[in-house]
Interface confidence: medium
């Protein structure tokens, strides 16, 4: 299992090459641990494999295996990144019949600078 309210090292292979190496669970979709997140991510692999957006891998990892810094500051993907990826990939999302999780609907995410991400306390944001 994972330790409550502390960052943990990333073990999902696809996301181990990201610029961050610590994550926190549950994620935005409520997946309890990395093994579940890895399985759920597989539905989106056609998008990653076909590289429909330059940012697809970054977005999927930030959504399913969120960045965690300073123990309990969890960083969800920013809205602008979400909008770009969704727009770039919409044709393939439709083609493959991929269900875009409502938790990842872009208008639910905050505008923020990807380099200086908005952080929030998972006690209230993820579990509330």
């Amino acid at each position: 299992g994972h330790s409550l309210f502390t960052c943990e090292p990333i073990t999902v292979p696809r996301c181990m090459k990201m610029a961050y190496n610590m994550t926190f669970f549950p994620n935005l979709m409520g997946h309890y641990d990395q093994s579940i997140a890895a399985v759920e991510m597989e539905h989106f692999l056609p998008l990653a494999n076909l590289e429909c957006s330059p940012n697809i891998e970054t977005f999927l990892c930030k959504a399913f295996v969120p960045t965690c810094i300073e123990q309990i500051h969890v960083v969800p993907p920013c809205r602008k990144l979400c909008e770009k990826v969704y727009s770039d990939c919409k044709k393939l999302i439709d083609t493959f019949g991929i269900r875009w999780p409502e938790e990842l609907e872009c208008d639910r995410l905050q505008y923020c600078d990807e380099t200086v991400p908005v952080t929030f306390d998972p006690h209230t944001e993820f579990l509330g």
């Epitope: 590289e51 330059p54 940012n55 970054t58 770039d88």
Partner: antibody, heavy 123, light 107 residues
Framework: QVQLVQSGAEVKKPGASVKVSCKAS????????MHWVRQAPGQGLEWMGR????????NYAQKFQGRVTMTRDTSTSTVYMELSSLRSEDTAVYYC????????????????WGQGTLVNVSS | DIQMTQSPSSLSASVGDRVTITCRAS??????LNWYQQKPGKAPKLLIY???SLQSGVPSRFSGSGSGTDFTLTISSLQPEDFATYYC?????????FGGGTKVEIK
């Protein structure tokens, strides 16, 4: 403002290779695919392929497969297009073009273009 | 590969004329069609994307329509700066392909 600045004109002999550069500025380099399009004298436009500056992933037109290589240097926001085994029919202006998105969900057009690089292949 | 056929290949028109250029795809491309304007010695300029969306900064006299296989670029009132070559391009699938171009000349 967005700018794509390409390297200068080249004269090459048949069988040689040419490497054209395209330096991007004014936007986040890794956010947009970069495409290469060429135009032979008095002819139309021909798509050669594209590179994902984020991952380095490429997608080449079948016609150029095995002869073209697209690379990028994220530290300088520059993409490169190398074409090998040149022949006279490769004489053309080579353009890099950035593919942006418009929130329309479509595969968008090329909204910014380099100034073009003339490659003359002649013996 | 998807073939893009433009017509006419050239046309002569006067300032103020309404000009229509057509583009036909060899298979359905939905609305994944773009239009470009190119002047001699210059890079192409994006006018219309997604068949009918006007690119930012492009005058409203340019408009695009169509879906599936048949598309149209219309210039409602030709201006002196509009004399150029126009290309359609499909962005439905790779390889991305362009029409052969339509040269708009002064009558």
């Amino acid at each position: 403002q967005v700018q794509l600045v390409q390297s200068g004109a080249e004269v090459k002999k048949p069988g040689a290779s040419v490497k054209v550069s395209c330096k991007a500025s004014g936007y986040t380099f890794t956010n947009n695919f970069m495409h290469w399009v060429r135009q032979a004298p008095g002819q139309g436009l021909e798509w050669m392929g594209r590179i994902n500056p984020n991952s380095g992933g490429t997608n080449y037109a079948q016609k150029f497969q095995g002869r073209v290589t697209m690379t990028r240097d994220t530290s300088t926001s520059t993409v490169y297009m190398e074409l090998s085994s040149l022949r006279s029919e490769d004489t053309a202006v080579y353009y890099c073009a950035s593919q942006n998105y418009y929130g329309s969900g479509s595969y968008p057009g090329f909204d910014y273009w380099g100034q073009g690089t003339l490659v003359n292949v002649s013996s | 590969d998807i073939q893009m056929t433009q017509s006419p290949s050239s046309l002569s028109a006067s300032v103020g004329d309404r000009v229509t250029i057509t583009c036909r795809a060899s298979q359905s491309i939905s609305s994944y069609l773009n239009w470009y304007q190119q002047k001699p010695g210059k890079a192409p300029k994006l006018l219309i994307y997604a068949a009918s969306s006007l690119q930012s900064g492009v005058p409203s006299r340019f408009s695009g329509s169509g879906s599936g296989t048949d598309f149209t670029l219309t210039i409602s009132s030709l201006q002196p700066e509009d004399f150029a070559t126009y290309y359609c391009q499909q962005s439905y699938s790779t390889p991305l392909t362009f029409g052969g171009g339509t040269k708009v000349e002064i009558k």
